[in-house]
């Protein structure tokens, strides 16, 4: 999701912008940190096993807007969180995962019939 | 049009601090980052680090940090470079130049350092 | 930290001539999700500060004149000047910015025959 006052239709920033990278740092990063011209992000998603996983980094103004829409994916649990408003800016975001639906117990990626 | 202005010359001693200005005008400050970087005689040039005025974020090169602080004063739109104790080492020009993507499109005119007793 | 590596450290032409001067890179500056060229190249005349020429290896800054052509990728760049002019006197800096700390080669120093 967008951090309110985001607007939703992606523009050109003016100048580069830092954010703190996770599990999903470039080669370029240095101390954790990556550069870009859309946005900072941090997501929350199930790993196979169903263990919770975060990783932050940065998401090019390219695509980014649909990759910050949160869009649900079939049996998938994740959650994302985009923001440009300051360098570093996602450190403060804390999405979390959203509620099991009932479907989920059933044909979820760690349960098997 | 795009300027940065910076004094033209500093003396001071060995031992003591200096603080650098850059003054920038003819476009919004907060919208680029300032950077500093230091040019011995006859040498290359060195990057000492950058700042974002807009939330006053900072990079440093490791080999400076213990050297330089970097800030800034959104109302006058002018960044400044405090550097401590002072050797000869310092001594220098050191030039702030802008930048939106990480190369420097304007540069002030730079200040002479020279650190002496 | 990247090291950059410029050569020739001087050179002397008469005007009208071509000249080329390399730079060369410790590692890659060429971004695999846009493959852009991380390099700018600037010319500092004599008692002037530094002036950029051309940023992303080859895209010439505006107002630089067009016998200013920048070329390479990867880890070898090279400045060419069509046709030299007296007023090209000056010293050549390359500048990585693929990763911090930014760093600068050596210079090549052009003198006018």
């Known amino acids: 999701k967008k951090e309110d006052g985001e607007s939703t239709a992606p523009t050109a920033r003016p100048k580069v912008l830092r954010c703190k990278c996770h599990h999903h740092c470039p080669e370029d990063s240095v101390n954790n940190i990556c550069s870009t011209d859309g946005y900072c992000f941090t997501m929350i998603e199930e790993d196979d096993s169903g263990t919770p996983v975060v990783t932050s980094g940065c998401l090019g103004l390219e695509g980014s807007d649909f990759q910050c829409r949160d869009t649900p994916i079939p049996h998938q649990r994740r959650s994302i969180e985009c923001c440009t408003e300051r360098n570093e800016c996602n450190k403060d975001l804390h999405p979390t995962l959203p509620p099991l639906k009932d479907r989920d117990f059933v044909d979820g990626p760690i349960h098997h019939k | 049009q795009v300027q940065l202005q910076q004094p033209g010359a500093e003396l001071v001693m060995p031992g003591a601090s200096v603080k650098l200005s850059c003054k920038a005008s003819g476009y919004t400050f907060t919208n680029y980052w300032m950077h500093w970087v230091k040019q011995r005689p006859g040498q290359g040039l060195e990057w000492i680090g950058e700042i974002d005025p807009s939330d006053v974020y900072t990079t440093y090169n490791q080999k400076f940090k213990d050297k330089a602080t970097l800030t800034v004063d959104k109302s006058s739109s002018t960044a400044y470079m405090q550097l401590i104790n002072l050797t000869s080492e310092d001594s220098a020009v050191y030039y702030c130049a802008r930048s939106g993507w990480d190369y420097f499109d304007y540069w002030g005119q730079g200040t002479a350092l020279t650190v002496s007793s | 930290d990247i090291v950059m590596t410029q050569s020739p450290s001087s050179l002397a032409m008469s005007v009208g001539q071509k000249v080329t001067m390399s730079c060369k890179s410790s590692q890659s500056l060429l971004k695999s999700n846009n493959q852009k060229n991380y390099l700018a190249w600037y010319q500092q005349k004599p008692g002037q500060s530094p002036k950029l020429l051309v940023y992303?290896?080859?895209t010439r800054e505006s107002g630089v004149p067009d016998r200013f052509i920048g070329s390479g990728s990867g880890t070898d760049f090279t400045l060419t000047i069509s046709s030299v002019q007296a007023e090209d006197l000056a010293d050549y800096f390359c500048?990585?910015?693929?990763?911090?700390?930014?760093?600068f080669g050596g210079g090549t120093k052009l003198e006018i025959k």
């Open positions: 992303f290896a080859s």
């Open positions: 500048q990585q910015y693929y990763s911090t700390p930014w760093t």
